[in-house]
Amino acid sequence: KKVVLGKKGDTVELTCTASQKKSIQFHWKNSNQIKILGNQGSFLTKGPSKLNDRADSRRSLWDQGNFPLIIKNLKIEDSDTYICEVEDQKEEVQLLVFGLTANSDTHLLQGQSLTLTLESPPGSSPSVQCRSPRGKNIQGGKTLSVSQLELQDSGTWTCTVLQNQKKVEFKIDIVVLAFQKASSIVYKKEGEQVEFSFPLAFTVEKLTGSGELWWQAERASSSKSWITFDLKNKEVSVKRVTQDPKLQMGKKLPLHLTLPQALPQYAGSGNLTLALEAKTGKLHQEVNLVVMRATQLQKNLTCEVWGPTSPKLMLSLKLENKEAKVSKREKAVWVLNPEAGMWQCLLSDSGQVLLESNIKVLPTWSTPVQP
Protein backbone atom coordinates (compact mmCIF):
# COMPACT_ATOMS: atom_id res chain seq x y z
CA LYS A 1 0.00 0.00 0.00
CA LYS A 2 1.36 3.38 -1.04
CA VAL A 3 1.58 6.03 1.72
CA VAL A 4 1.14 9.73 0.97
CA LEU A 5 1.60 12.47 3.57
CA GLY A 6 -0.43 15.64 3.29
CA LYS A 7 -0.53 18.99 5.06
CA LYS A 8 -3.68 20.40 6.62
CA GLY A 9 -5.06 23.15 4.38
CA ASP A 10 -3.01 22.06 1.37
CA THR A 11 -3.99 20.18 -1.79
CA VAL A 12 -2.92 16.59 -2.39
CA GLU A 13 -2.99 14.59 -5.62
CA LEU A 14 -3.38 10.83 -5.26
CA THR A 15 -2.30 9.10 -8.44
CA CYS A 16 -3.93 6.20 -10.21
CA THR A 17 -2.55 4.90 -13.49
CA ALA A 18 -3.94 2.52 -16.07
CA SER A 19 -1.80 0.51 -18.49
CA GLN A 20 -3.84 1.86 -21.42
CA LYS A 21 -2.98 5.43 -22.30
CA LYS A 22 -6.58 6.45 -22.88
CA SER A 23 -9.66 7.58 -21.00
CA ILE A 24 -11.33 4.53 -19.52
CA GLN A 25 -13.75 4.09 -16.66
CA PHE A 26 -12.37 4.60 -13.15
CA HIS A 27 -13.61 5.50 -9.73
CA TRP A 28 -12.18 6.41 -6.37
CA LYS A 29 -13.68 5.13 -3.11
CA ASN A 30 -12.77 5.54 0.54
CA SER A 31 -12.18 2.70 3.00
CA ASN A 32 -15.94 2.54 3.69
CA GLN A 33 -16.49 1.84 -0.03
CA ILE A 34 -18.23 5.20 -0.47
CA LYS A 35 -17.71 6.54 -3.98
CA ILE A 36 -15.86 9.86 -4.07
CA LEU A 37 -15.57 10.47 -7.78
CA GLY A 38 -15.24 8.76 -11.11
CA ASN A 39 -16.21 9.13 -14.73
CA GLN A 40 -18.96 8.22 -17.14
CA GLY A 41 -17.30 8.67 -20.51
CA SER A 42 -15.93 12.18 -20.34
CA PHE A 43 -18.28 13.18 -17.52
CA LEU A 44 -16.78 13.65 -14.08
CA THR A 45 -19.21 12.24 -11.55
CA LYS A 46 -19.13 12.66 -7.79
CA GLY A 47 -20.49 10.34 -5.14
CA PRO A 48 -22.11 11.10 -1.77
CA SER A 49 -18.86 11.45 0.19
CA LYS A 50 -18.10 14.30 2.58
CA LEU A 51 -15.28 15.27 0.22
CA ASN A 52 -17.71 16.38 -2.46
CA ASP A 53 -16.83 20.09 -2.36
CA ARG A 54 -13.12 19.41 -2.13
CA ALA A 55 -12.59 16.43 -4.45
CA ASP A 56 -11.51 16.95 -8.04
CA SER A 57 -9.80 15.23 -10.93
CA ARG A 58 -8.23 16.41 -14.17
CA ARG A 59 -9.89 15.42 -17.44
CA SER A 60 -6.77 16.40 -19.36
CA LEU A 61 -4.88 13.56 -17.66
CA TRP A 62 -7.49 10.87 -18.35
CA ASP A 63 -6.45 10.57 -22.00
CA GLN A 64 -2.94 9.71 -20.77
CA GLY A 65 -4.27 6.91 -18.57
CA ASN A 66 -3.90 8.96 -15.36
CA PHE A 67 -6.91 9.30 -13.08
CA PRO A 68 -5.91 11.41 -10.10
CA LEU A 69 -7.98 12.15 -7.03
CA ILE A 70 -7.24 15.72 -6.02
CA ILE A 71 -8.34 16.72 -2.52
CA LYS A 72 -8.26 20.42 -1.73
CA ASN A 73 -8.10 22.16 1.65
CA LEU A 74 -7.04 18.97 3.44
CA LYS A 75 -8.38 18.17 6.89
CA ILE A 76 -6.87 15.76 9.45
CA GLU A 77 -10.03 13.62 9.15
CA ASP A 78 -9.33 13.11 5.42
CA SER A 79 -6.68 10.64 6.56
CA ASP A 80 -7.94 7.33 5.17
CA THR A 81 -7.21 4.60 2.68
CA TYR A 82 -8.41 5.60 -0.79
CA ILE A 83 -9.05 2.95 -3.44
CA CYS A 84 -8.83 3.60 -7.16
CA GLU A 85 -10.66 1.04 -9.28
CA VAL A 86 -9.54 0.95 -12.91
CA GLU A 87 -9.15 -1.92 -15.46
CA ASP A 88 -10.39 -4.50 -12.94
CA GLN A 89 -7.56 -3.50 -10.66
CA LYS A 90 -7.54 -1.81 -7.28
CA GLU A 91 -4.84 0.63 -6.25
CA GLU A 92 -4.76 1.53 -2.56
CA VAL A 93 -3.27 4.75 -1.26
CA GLN A 94 -3.05 5.57 2.42
CA LEU A 95 -3.31 9.31 3.01
CA LEU A 96 -2.08 10.70 6.32
CA VAL A 97 -2.78 14.38 6.92
CA PHE A 98 -0.79 16.35 9.50
CA GLY A 99 -1.10 19.86 10.83
CA LEU A 100 1.46 21.89 12.76
CA THR A 101 0.42 25.01 14.60
CA ALA A 102 1.92 27.45 17.07
CA ASN A 103 0.21 27.21 20.46
CA SER A 104 -0.92 30.80 20.66
CA ASP A 105 0.03 33.60 18.39
CA THR A 106 3.02 33.49 16.07
CA HIS A 107 3.95 36.97 17.39
CA LEU A 108 5.62 36.38 20.74
CA LEU A 109 7.43 38.64 23.18
CA GLN A 110 11.13 38.18 23.76
CA GLY A 111 11.60 35.74 26.65
CA GLN A 112 8.29 33.99 26.11
CA SER A 113 7.88 30.34 25.14
CA LEU A 114 6.94 28.92 21.79
CA THR A 115 5.00 25.65 21.68
CA LEU A 116 4.39 23.89 18.39
CA THR A 117 1.63 21.29 18.38
CA LEU A 118 1.33 18.53 15.83
CA GLU A 119 -2.13 17.39 14.79
CA SER A 120 -2.01 13.87 13.48
CA PRO A 121 -4.46 11.14 12.50
CA PRO A 122 -5.31 8.37 14.99
CA GLY A 123 -2.93 5.43 14.82
CA SER A 124 -0.01 7.41 13.43
CA SER A 125 3.25 7.76 15.34
CA PRO A 126 5.11 10.65 13.74
CA SER A 127 8.30 12.29 14.90
CA VAL A 128 8.95 16.01 14.47
CA GLN A 129 12.17 17.92 14.08
CA CYS A 130 12.25 21.70 13.86
CA ARG A 131 15.08 23.99 12.87
CA SER A 132 15.04 27.57 14.10
CA PRO A 133 16.20 30.50 11.94
CA ARG A 134 19.51 30.50 13.83
CA GLY A 135 20.06 26.81 13.09
CA LYS A 136 19.08 25.34 16.44
CA ASN A 137 17.46 21.87 16.13
CA ILE A 138 14.71 20.67 18.45
CA GLN A 139 12.99 17.30 18.39
CA GLY A 140 9.80 15.99 19.86
CA GLY A 141 6.57 14.08 19.48
CA LYS A 142 3.14 15.73 19.52
CA THR A 143 4.46 18.98 21.04
CA LEU A 144 7.72 20.88 20.85
CA SER A 145 8.57 23.69 23.23
CA VAL A 146 11.19 26.39 23.11
CA SER A 147 11.50 28.54 26.20
CA GLN A 148 13.04 31.99 26.44
CA LEU A 149 12.70 33.09 22.83
CA GLU A 150 15.44 35.40 21.63
CA LEU A 151 15.46 38.00 18.91
CA GLN A 152 17.42 35.64 16.63
CA ASP A 153 14.49 33.19 16.80
CA SER A 154 12.47 35.52 14.59
CA GLY A 155 11.95 34.16 11.10
CA THR A 156 10.91 30.94 9.42
CA TRP A 157 10.97 27.76 11.46
CA THR A 158 11.23 24.65 9.27
CA CYS A 159 9.68 21.55 10.77
CA THR A 160 9.87 18.06 9.28
CA VAL A 161 7.30 15.42 10.20
CA LEU A 162 8.45 11.82 9.65
CA GLN A 163 6.02 8.91 9.31
CA ASN A 164 6.48 5.56 7.55
CA GLN A 165 9.86 6.75 6.19
CA LYS A 166 8.04 9.56 4.40
CA LYS A 167 8.34 13.18 5.36
CA VAL A 168 6.35 16.36 5.07
CA GLU A 169 7.75 19.82 5.72
CA PHE A 170 6.04 22.71 7.46
CA LYS A 171 7.20 26.30 7.53
CA ILE A 172 6.02 28.55 10.34
CA ASP A 173 6.86 32.23 10.50
CA ILE A 174 7.57 33.37 14.03
CA VAL A 175 7.95 37.03 14.96
CA VAL A 176 9.76 37.79 18.22
CA LEU A 177 8.57 41.14 19.50
CA ALA A 178 11.50 43.06 20.92
CA PHE A 179 13.50 46.25 20.72
CA GLN A 180 16.53 46.08 18.44
CA LYS A 181 18.84 46.66 21.41
CA ALA A 182 18.34 45.53 24.97
CA SER A 183 20.38 48.44 26.24
CA SER A 184 21.94 51.62 24.92
CA ILE A 185 24.07 54.40 26.32
CA VAL A 186 24.19 58.06 25.31
CA TYR A 187 27.19 60.25 26.11
CA LYS A 188 26.60 64.02 26.16
CA LYS A 189 28.29 67.22 27.25
CA GLU A 190 26.35 69.35 29.69
CA GLY A 191 23.84 71.55 27.87
CA GLU A 192 23.66 69.48 24.70
CA GLN A 193 20.36 68.16 23.38
CA VAL A 194 19.88 64.43 23.98
CA GLU A 195 18.18 62.08 21.51
CA PHE A 196 16.96 58.69 22.70
CA SER A 197 15.81 56.22 20.04
CA PHE A 198 14.03 52.92 20.65
CA PRO A 199 13.83 51.08 17.30
CA LEU A 200 11.73 47.91 17.20
CA ALA A 201 13.14 44.70 15.76
CA PHE A 202 9.91 43.78 13.95
CA THR A 203 7.34 45.25 11.62
CA VAL A 204 3.63 44.61 11.83
CA GLU A 205 0.67 46.08 9.95
CA LYS A 206 -0.92 47.67 12.99
CA LEU A 207 0.81 48.36 16.25
CA THR A 208 -1.21 49.47 19.26
CA GLY A 209 -0.23 49.71 22.89
CA SER A 210 1.04 51.99 25.60
CA GLY A 211 4.43 52.77 27.06
CA GLU A 212 6.30 54.55 29.80
CA LEU A 213 9.83 55.71 30.53
CA TRP A 214 10.92 55.37 34.13
CA TRP A 215 14.09 57.19 35.07
CA GLN A 216 16.51 56.60 37.90
CA ALA A 217 18.77 59.63 38.15
CA GLU A 218 22.13 58.95 39.75
CA ARG A 219 21.58 61.76 42.21
CA ALA A 220 17.99 60.75 43.09
CA SER A 221 16.97 58.31 45.78
CA SER A 222 14.07 56.86 43.77
CA SER A 223 13.02 56.48 40.15
CA LYS A 224 10.29 58.53 38.56
CA SER A 225 8.11 58.32 35.49
CA TRP A 226 9.32 60.81 32.90
CA ILE A 227 6.72 60.17 30.21
CA THR A 228 3.76 57.95 29.38
CA PHE A 229 2.41 57.53 25.88
CA ASP A 230 -0.04 55.64 23.71
CA LEU A 231 0.62 53.91 20.41
CA LYS A 232 -2.26 53.53 17.98
CA ASN A 233 -1.67 52.11 14.50
CA LYS A 234 1.97 53.21 14.70
CA GLU A 235 0.98 56.78 15.72
CA VAL A 236 2.44 58.00 19.02
CA SER A 237 0.55 60.33 21.37
CA VAL A 238 1.90 61.59 24.69
CA LYS A 239 -0.39 61.06 27.69
CA ARG A 240 1.66 62.57 30.49
CA VAL A 241 5.09 64.14 30.77
CA THR A 242 7.01 65.54 33.77
CA GLN A 243 7.68 69.27 33.96
CA ASP A 244 11.34 68.65 34.72
CA PRO A 245 12.74 67.46 32.41
CA LYS A 246 10.20 68.37 29.71
CA LEU A 247 10.73 65.53 27.24
CA GLN A 248 9.47 65.70 23.69
CA MET A 249 8.37 62.63 21.77
CA GLY A 250 8.18 61.92 18.04
CA LYS A 251 4.73 61.18 16.61
CA LYS A 252 5.87 58.26 14.42
CA LEU A 253 7.87 55.06 14.89
CA PRO A 254 10.63 54.40 15.81
CA LEU A 255 9.94 55.68 19.31
CA HIS A 256 12.02 58.81 19.70
CA LEU A 257 12.52 61.01 22.76
CA THR A 258 14.30 64.36 22.98
CA LEU A 259 15.69 65.81 26.19
CA PRO A 260 16.29 69.55 25.58
CA GLN A 261 19.45 69.68 27.70
CA ALA A 262 21.84 67.18 29.21
CA LEU A 263 22.28 68.17 32.84
CA PRO A 264 24.09 66.35 35.66
CA GLN A 265 20.82 65.90 37.57
CA TYR A 266 19.40 63.92 34.62
CA ALA A 267 22.34 61.52 34.30
CA GLY A 268 21.32 57.97 35.12
CA SER A 269 19.41 54.99 33.74
CA GLY A 270 15.99 54.67 32.27
CA ASN A 271 13.73 51.77 31.44
CA LEU A 272 11.31 52.14 28.55
CA THR A 273 8.49 49.63 28.67
CA LEU A 274 6.00 48.99 25.90
CA ALA A 275 2.83 46.99 26.47
CA LEU A 276 1.30 45.80 23.22
CA GLU A 277 -2.42 45.29 22.76
CA ALA A 278 -3.56 41.66 23.14
CA LYS A 279 -0.13 40.62 24.45
CA THR A 280 0.74 39.57 27.97
CA GLY A 281 4.02 40.98 29.15
CA LYS A 282 6.00 44.01 28.05
CA LEU A 283 8.94 44.93 25.86
CA HIS A 284 11.84 46.57 27.66
CA GLN A 285 14.78 48.68 26.64
CA GLU A 286 17.28 50.13 29.04
CA VAL A 287 18.79 53.49 28.22
CA ASN A 288 21.66 55.21 30.01
CA LEU A 289 22.73 58.84 29.98
CA VAL A 290 26.26 59.95 30.87
CA VAL A 291 26.80 63.70 31.20
CA MET A 292 30.20 65.47 31.21
CA ARG A 293 31.02 68.87 32.63
CA ALA A 294 34.37 70.69 32.48
CA THR A 295 34.79 73.77 34.72
CA GLN A 296 37.49 76.09 36.01
CA LEU A 297 37.03 77.57 39.44
CA GLN A 298 39.85 79.82 40.58
CA LYS A 299 43.00 77.75 40.19
CA ASN A 300 41.23 74.42 39.79
CA LEU A 301 40.33 72.88 36.40
CA THR A 302 37.84 70.06 36.96
CA CYS A 303 36.27 67.47 34.69
CA GLU A 304 33.36 65.38 35.95
CA VAL A 305 31.03 62.74 34.56
CA TRP A 306 27.71 61.63 35.96
CA GLY A 307 25.76 58.56 35.08
CA PRO A 308 26.40 54.82 34.72
CA THR A 309 30.00 54.46 33.62
CA SER A 310 31.88 51.17 33.74
CA PRO A 311 34.92 50.93 36.03
CA LYS A 312 37.24 50.46 33.03
CA LEU A 313 36.41 53.88 31.55
CA MET A 314 39.23 56.42 31.74
CA LEU A 315 38.70 60.11 32.42
CA SER A 316 41.57 62.39 31.33
CA LEU A 317 42.49 66.05 31.27
CA LYS A 318 45.06 67.16 28.73
CA LEU A 319 46.28 70.28 27.12
CA GLU A 320 45.67 70.20 23.39
CA ASN A 321 48.39 68.29 21.47
CA LYS A 322 50.12 67.31 24.73
CA GLU A 323 50.22 64.24 26.88
CA ALA A 324 47.42 63.79 29.42
CA LYS A 325 48.15 65.69 32.59
CA VAL A 326 45.87 63.47 34.60
CA SER A 327 44.18 60.18 33.71
CA LYS A 328 42.14 58.11 36.15
CA ARG A 329 39.48 55.40 36.31
CA GLU A 330 37.33 57.80 38.30
CA LYS A 331 34.33 60.04 37.72
CA ALA A 332 36.16 63.30 38.43
CA VAL A 333 39.67 64.56 37.65
CA TRP A 334 41.24 67.95 38.16
CA VAL A 335 44.40 69.96 37.55
CA LEU A 336 45.57 72.69 39.91
CA ASN A 337 47.01 75.83 38.38
CA PRO A 338 46.43 74.78 34.78
CA GLU A 339 48.52 76.54 32.20
CA ALA A 340 46.80 78.67 29.61
CA GLY A 341 45.49 77.00 26.44
CA MET A 342 42.75 74.71 25.14
CA TRP A 343 42.19 71.87 27.56
CA GLN A 344 40.41 68.68 26.66
CA CYS A 345 38.45 66.47 28.98
CA LEU A 346 38.18 62.95 27.49
CA LEU A 347 36.13 59.96 28.54
CA SER A 348 37.52 56.90 26.80
CA ASP A 349 37.21 53.16 26.66
CA SER A 350 40.34 51.23 25.63
CA GLY A 351 41.66 54.24 23.77
CA GLN A 352 38.37 55.02 22.00
CA VAL A 353 37.02 58.45 22.90
CA LEU A 354 33.37 58.31 23.96
CA LEU A 355 32.95 61.91 25.07
CA GLU A 356 35.02 65.06 24.81
CA SER A 357 34.59 68.52 26.27
CA ASN A 358 36.91 71.45 25.57
CA ILE A 359 37.58 74.35 27.91
CA LYS A 360 39.82 77.32 27.21
CA VAL A 361 42.03 78.38 30.10
CA LEU A 362 43.11 82.01 29.78
CA PRO A 363 46.14 83.55 31.43
CA THR A 364 45.51 83.98 35.15
CA TRP A 365 44.22 87.57 34.92
CA SER A 366 41.14 86.63 32.92
CA THR A 367 38.13 84.28 33.38
CA PRO A 368 37.91 80.93 31.50
CA VAL A 369 35.94 80.55 28.28
CA GLN A 370 33.96 77.46 27.46
CA PRO A 371 33.63 77.05 23.66
Epitope: G41, S42, L44, P48, K72
Partner: antibody
Framework: QVQLVQSGAEVKKPGASVKVSCKAS????????ISWVRQAPGQGLEWMGI????????SYAQKFQGRVTMTRDTSTSTVYMELSSLRSEDTAVYYC???????????????WGQGTLVTVSS | DIQMTQSPSSLSASVGDRVTITCRAS??????LAWYQQKPGKAPKLLIY???ILHSGVPSRFSGSGSGTDFTLTISSLQPEDFATYYC?????????FGQGTRLEIK
Protein backbone atom coordinates in the same frame (compact mmCIF):
# COMPACT_ATOMS: atom_id res chain seq x y z
CA GLN B 1 -36.98 23.95 -27.02
CA VAL B 2 -35.09 23.96 -23.68
CA GLN B 3 -35.89 26.89 -21.40
CA LEU B 4 -34.63 27.88 -17.96
CA VAL B 5 -36.88 30.39 -16.23
CA GLN B 6 -35.67 32.07 -13.04
CA SER B 7 -37.51 33.78 -10.21
CA GLY B 8 -37.73 37.57 -9.99
CA ALA B 9 -35.39 40.20 -8.57
CA GLU B 10 -34.81 40.32 -4.81
CA VAL B 11 -33.70 43.03 -2.38
CA LYS B 12 -32.19 41.76 0.85
CA LYS B 13 -30.57 43.18 3.97
CA PRO B 14 -27.03 42.20 5.00
CA GLY B 15 -27.06 38.97 7.02
CA ALA B 16 -30.24 37.70 5.40
CA SER B 17 -30.62 34.75 2.98
CA VAL B 18 -31.95 34.59 -0.55
CA LYS B 19 -33.38 31.63 -2.44
CA VAL B 20 -33.47 31.79 -6.24
CA SER B 21 -35.35 29.25 -8.32
CA CYS B 22 -34.71 27.97 -11.85
CA LYS B 23 -37.45 26.00 -13.61
CA ALA B 24 -36.45 23.80 -16.56
CA SER B 25 -38.74 22.89 -19.42
CA UNK B 26 -38.41 21.29 -22.86
CA UNK B 27 -35.91 18.58 -21.94
CA UNK B 28 -35.35 15.65 -19.62
CA UNK B 29 -34.79 17.34 -16.27
CA UNK B 30 -32.73 14.54 -14.70
CA UNK B 31 -30.34 14.26 -17.68
CA UNK B 32 -28.48 17.52 -17.17
CA UNK B 33 -26.56 19.06 -14.33
CA ILE B 34 -27.35 22.68 -13.45
CA SER B 35 -24.67 25.15 -12.47
CA TRP B 36 -25.11 28.55 -10.88
CA VAL B 37 -22.96 31.43 -12.12
CA ARG B 38 -23.07 34.96 -10.77
CA GLN B 39 -22.02 38.33 -12.15
CA ALA B 40 -21.51 41.37 -9.95
CA PRO B 41 -22.25 44.77 -11.57
CA GLY B 42 -19.59 45.53 -14.19
CA GLN B 43 -17.67 42.37 -13.29
CA GLY B 44 -16.95 38.97 -14.84
CA LEU B 45 -18.59 35.58 -14.47
CA GLU B 46 -18.07 33.55 -11.30
CA TRP B 47 -18.98 29.87 -11.01
CA MET B 48 -20.67 29.03 -7.71
CA GLY B 49 -21.40 25.33 -7.89
CA ILE B 50 -23.28 22.52 -9.59
CA UNK B 51 -26.18 20.19 -8.78
CA UNK B 52 -26.91 16.89 -10.46
CA UNK B 53 -30.73 16.78 -10.63
CA UNK B 54 -30.89 12.97 -10.89
CA UNK B 55 -29.10 12.14 -7.63
CA UNK B 56 -29.13 15.61 -6.10
CA UNK B 57 -25.38 15.55 -5.43
CA UNK B 58 -23.74 18.96 -5.26
CA SER B 59 -20.29 20.47 -5.55
CA TYR B 60 -19.63 24.07 -4.54
CA ALA B 61 -16.81 26.50 -5.27
CA GLN B 62 -14.59 26.92 -2.23
CA LYS B 63 -15.47 30.61 -1.92
CA PHE B 64 -19.12 29.79 -1.26
CA GLN B 65 -18.79 26.65 0.84
CA GLY B 66 -20.80 26.95 4.03
CA ARG B 67 -22.98 29.74 2.61
CA VAL B 68 -24.55 28.18 -0.49
CA THR B 69 -27.04 25.34 -0.75
CA MET B 70 -28.30 23.94 -4.03
CA THR B 71 -31.38 21.73 -4.04
CA ARG B 72 -33.83 20.36 -6.58
CA ASP B 73 -37.46 19.38 -6.81
CA THR B 74 -37.87 16.72 -9.51
CA SER B 75 -41.67 16.94 -9.39
CA THR B 76 -41.58 20.53 -10.65
CA SER B 77 -38.28 20.29 -12.62
CA THR B 78 -36.93 23.14 -10.50
CA VAL B 79 -33.54 23.73 -8.95
CA TYR B 80 -32.90 26.21 -6.14
CA MET B 81 -29.87 28.14 -5.01
CA GLU B 82 -29.89 29.57 -1.49
CA LEU B 83 -27.16 31.96 -0.36
CA SER B 84 -27.00 32.87 3.33
CA SER B 85 -25.23 35.53 5.43
CA LEU B 86 -25.55 38.02 2.58
CA ARG B 87 -23.19 40.96 2.34
CA SER B 88 -23.10 43.96 0.00
CA GLU B 89 -20.55 42.25 -2.26
CA ASP B 90 -23.12 39.52 -2.99
CA THR B 91 -25.08 42.06 -5.03
CA ALA B 92 -25.09 40.44 -8.48
CA VAL B 93 -27.11 38.84 -11.24
CA TYR B 94 -27.41 35.12 -10.51
CA TYR B 95 -27.75 32.78 -13.52
CA CYS B 96 -28.63 29.13 -13.65
CA UNK B 97 -27.05 27.34 -16.62
CA UNK B 98 -27.49 23.84 -18.04
CA UNK B 99 -24.32 21.83 -18.34
CA UNK B 100 -24.75 20.05 -21.61
CA UNK B 101 -23.83 16.41 -21.94
CA UNK B 102 -23.41 16.25 -25.70
CA UNK B 103 -20.00 17.91 -25.45
CA UNK B 104 -17.98 19.75 -22.81
CA UNK B 105 -18.10 16.68 -20.53
CA UNK B 106 -21.17 18.20 -18.93
CA UNK B 107 -19.22 21.27 -17.89
CA UNK B 108 -19.93 24.05 -20.34
CA UNK B 109 -23.24 25.73 -20.63
CA UNK B 110 -25.50 25.74 -23.67
CA UNK B 111 -28.67 27.05 -22.05
CA TRP B 112 -28.88 29.88 -19.51
CA GLY B 113 -31.67 31.36 -17.41
CA GLN B 114 -32.50 35.04 -17.87
CA GLY B 115 -30.76 35.95 -14.61
CA THR B 116 -32.05 37.13 -11.23
CA LEU B 117 -30.78 40.39 -9.77
CA VAL B 118 -30.14 40.13 -6.05
CA THR B 119 -29.45 43.45 -4.33
CA VAL B 120 -28.00 43.42 -0.82
CA SER B 121 -28.41 46.77 0.89
CA SER B 122 -29.09 48.07 4.38
CA ASP C 1 -8.03 26.38 -8.58
CA ILE C 2 -6.99 26.86 -12.20
CA GLN C 3 -6.62 30.56 -13.05
CA MET C 4 -7.65 31.86 -16.44
CA THR C 5 -6.17 35.09 -17.76
CA GLN C 6 -7.53 36.88 -20.81
CA SER C 7 -5.84 39.55 -22.89
CA PRO C 8 -6.49 42.23 -23.76
CA SER C 9 -9.08 43.25 -21.20
CA SER C 10 -10.61 45.61 -23.74
CA LEU C 11 -10.15 46.21 -27.43
CA SER C 12 -11.45 48.66 -30.03
CA ALA C 13 -12.00 47.52 -33.60
CA SER C 14 -14.01 48.35 -36.70
CA VAL C 15 -16.56 46.36 -38.69
CA GLY C 16 -14.71 44.06 -41.08
CA ASP C 17 -11.59 43.81 -38.85
CA ARG C 18 -9.98 40.52 -37.86
CA VAL C 19 -9.79 40.27 -34.09
CA THR C 20 -7.93 37.83 -31.81
CA ILE C 21 -8.49 37.37 -28.08
CA THR C 22 -6.16 35.19 -26.04
CA CYS C 23 -6.70 33.14 -22.91
CA ARG C 24 -4.01 31.55 -20.77
CA ALA C 25 -4.53 28.80 -18.16
CA SER C 26 -2.36 28.59 -15.04
CA UNK C 27 -1.78 24.89 -15.80
CA UNK C 28 -2.18 22.46 -18.68
CA UNK C 29 -5.91 21.94 -19.40
CA UNK C 30 -5.50 20.09 -22.71
CA UNK C 31 -8.45 21.28 -24.85
CA UNK C 32 -11.02 21.60 -22.04
CA LEU C 33 -11.85 25.19 -22.85
CA ALA C 34 -15.02 27.02 -23.91
CA TRP C 35 -15.68 30.57 -25.19
CA TYR C 36 -18.80 32.65 -24.48
CA GLN C 37 -20.21 35.93 -25.81
CA GLN C 38 -22.19 38.23 -23.54
CA LYS C 39 -24.11 41.37 -24.45
CA PRO C 40 -25.17 43.98 -21.84
CA GLY C 41 -28.17 42.85 -19.77
CA LYS C 42 -28.20 39.40 -21.38
CA ALA C 43 -27.04 35.93 -20.36
CA PRO C 44 -23.82 34.59 -21.92
CA LYS C 45 -24.00 32.46 -25.10
CA LEU C 46 -21.80 29.44 -25.79
CA LEU C 47 -19.66 29.98 -28.94
CA ILE C 48 -16.95 27.32 -28.84
CA TYR C 49 -16.19 24.24 -26.76
CA UNK C 50 -13.29 21.77 -26.68
CA UNK C 51 -11.08 24.77 -27.62
CA UNK C 52 -12.02 24.68 -31.32
CA ILE C 53 -15.48 23.18 -31.91
CA LEU C 54 -18.11 25.67 -32.98
CA HIS C 55 -21.39 25.38 -31.09
CA SER C 56 -24.46 24.87 -33.29
CA GLY C 57 -25.86 28.09 -34.75
CA VAL C 58 -22.64 30.06 -34.25
CA PRO C 59 -21.42 31.88 -37.40
CA SER C 60 -18.30 30.44 -39.03
CA ARG C 61 -16.42 33.76 -38.71
CA PHE C 62 -15.78 32.64 -35.11
CA SER C 63 -12.97 30.14 -34.59
CA GLY C 64 -10.96 28.83 -31.67
CA SER C 65 -7.54 27.26 -31.37
CA GLY C 66 -4.94 26.21 -28.85
CA SER C 67 -4.18 23.42 -26.44
CA GLY C 68 -2.41 23.06 -23.08
CA THR C 69 -2.21 26.54 -21.59
CA ASP C 70 -2.60 28.99 -24.51
CA PHE C 71 -5.81 29.53 -26.44
CA THR C 72 -7.20 32.06 -28.92
CA LEU C 73 -10.62 33.14 -30.13
CA THR C 74 -10.58 34.72 -33.58
CA ILE C 75 -13.32 36.68 -35.33
CA SER C 76 -12.29 36.80 -38.99
CA SER C 77 -14.45 39.73 -40.07
CA LEU C 78 -16.21 41.73 -37.37
CA GLN C 79 -19.93 42.32 -37.74
CA PRO C 80 -21.92 44.99 -35.84
CA GLU C 81 -23.58 42.31 -33.67
CA ASP C 82 -20.18 41.00 -32.49
CA PHE C 83 -19.47 43.98 -30.24
CA ALA C 84 -19.81 42.38 -26.80
CA THR C 85 -17.77 40.92 -23.93
CA TYR C 86 -16.08 37.54 -24.47
CA TYR C 87 -15.17 35.03 -21.74
CA CYS C 88 -13.09 31.88 -21.75
CA UNK C 89 -13.86 29.04 -19.32
CA UNK C 90 -11.90 25.94 -18.32
CA UNK C 91 -13.59 22.67 -17.44
CA UNK C 92 -10.56 20.42 -17.02
CA UNK C 93 -11.18 20.71 -13.28
CA UNK C 94 -14.62 20.08 -11.82
CA UNK C 95 -14.22 23.47 -10.14
CA UNK C 96 -14.96 25.65 -13.15
CA UNK C 97 -13.24 29.01 -13.64
CA PHE C 98 -13.73 31.83 -16.12
CA GLY C 99 -11.35 34.40 -17.54
CA GLN C 100 -11.96 38.01 -16.45
CA GLY C 101 -13.44 38.93 -19.84
CA THR C 102 -12.46 40.94 -22.93
CA ARG C 103 -14.65 43.87 -23.90
CA LEU C 104 -14.81 44.40 -27.66
CA GLU C 105 -15.88 47.95 -28.58
CA ILE C 106 -16.52 49.81 -31.81
CA LYS C 107 -13.63 52.04 -32.79
Amino acid sequence: QVQLVQSGAEVKKPGASVKVSCKASGGTFSSYAISWVRQAPGQGLEWMGIINPSGGSTSYAQKFQGRVTMTRDTSTSTVYMELSSLRSEDTAVYYCARATGLYCSGSCFDYWGQGTLVTVSS
Amino acid sequence: DIQMTQSPSSLSASVGDRVTITCRASQDISNYLAWYQQKPGKAPKLLIYAASILHSGVPSRFSGSGSGTDFTLTISSLQPEDFATYYCQQYDSSFITFGQGTRLEIK
